[in-house]
Interface confidence: medium
């Protein structure tokens, strides 16, 4: 099965890297520093 991060979820993560967790069939984001949220779209104002 192809990695959805390279297809339909290619632009899913705004400030982070798309990760596909194969054993859960789940697309998630690993955020850049200072960013958080499902798509790494929220900025941590305390950082």
């Amino acid at each position: 099965k192809k990695n959805p991060c390279n297809a339909e979820f290619q632009n899913f993560c705004i400030h982070g890297e798309c990760k596909y967790i194969e054993h859960l069939e789940a697309v998630t984001c690993k955020c850049q520093q200072e960013y958080f949220g499902e798509r790494c779209g929220e900025k941590d104002l305390l950082a």
Epitope: K19, H23, L24, E25, A26, T28, K30, Q33, Y35
Partner: antibody
């Protein structure tokens, strides 16, 4: 609001079968792995099964492997647990639980929301 | 399978006093870059379990800051800085680093 409502529990004889259901609402069901956890009377929690978002991968402890089958219908926002060859030791409250993810700058999967449970009694 | 051992089994506390629960795993729960999959759940009498702490020390949504988690590797602790009446119940640690996922036996917090 995340809601998980289990049903299908009841009294069954040893060797019998039962199918539990969990109706999910308040979130995009198809995006979340799901689990079943049980609690025997006056005992602790025991993980029973987990299923991936699309249902391709399923996981069980040895205590139920080969007897229980987890499945899901994403179109119906529903999770199921088919229980066969039931034993007295399967008597428990069965909880349906959502598997994260919780985002804190990186994904992390945990059983973040649980249903109220449905009671299964295996007795002759 | 990873065995999760909690202590004490029962914890009688005075309202307003601190409380501490220990959880030890039979092997390390560190999972590479993904962190440590150690969680704490609270089960109040007659209710279903609720997620309290995830990833060792992160409080879940709506959890009061009197609850804190700490630890690493195989040794973990849940602390309640000042116990309130609503904190009565059973607390479970749980690991989801390795299948099968396993829970500790539980610690019953009650008011003296």
């Amino acid at each position: 609001e995340v809601q998980l409502v289990e049903s299908g529990g009841g009294l069954v004889k040893p060797g019998g079968s039962l199918r539990l259901s969990c109706a999910a609402s308040g979130f995009t069901f198809s995006s979340y792995p799901m689990s079943w956890v049980r609690q025997a009377p006056e005992k602790g929690l025991e993980w029973v099964s987990t299923i991936s978002t699309g249902g391709r991968y399923t996981y069980y402890p040895d205590s139920v492997k080969g007897r229980f089958t987890i499945s899901r219908d994403n179109a119906k926002n529903s999770l199921y647990l088919q229980m066969n060859s039931l034993r007295a030791e399967d008597t428990a409250v069965y909880y349906c639980a959502r598997q994260g993810p919780i985002y804190y700058g990186n994904y992390y999967y945990a059983m973040d929301y649980w249903g109220q449970g449905t009671t299964v009694t295996v007795s002759s | 399978d990873i065995v999760m051992t909690q202590s004490p089994l029962s914890l009688p506390v005075t309202l307003g006093d601190p409380a501490s629960i220990s959880c030890r795993s039979s092997q390390s729960l560190v999972d590479g870059e993904d962190g440590t999959y150690l969680n704490w759940f609270q089960q109040r009498p007659g209710q279903s379990p609720k997620l309290l702490i995830y990833k060792v020390s992160e409080r879940f949504d709506g959890v009061p800051d009197r609850f804190s988690g700490s630890g690493s590797g195989t040794d973990f602790t849940l602390k309640i800085s000042r116990v309130e009446a609503e904190d009565v119940g059973v607390y479970y640690c749980s690991q989801s680093t390795h299948v099968p996922y396993t829970f500790g036996g539980g610690t019953k917090v009650e008011i003296k």
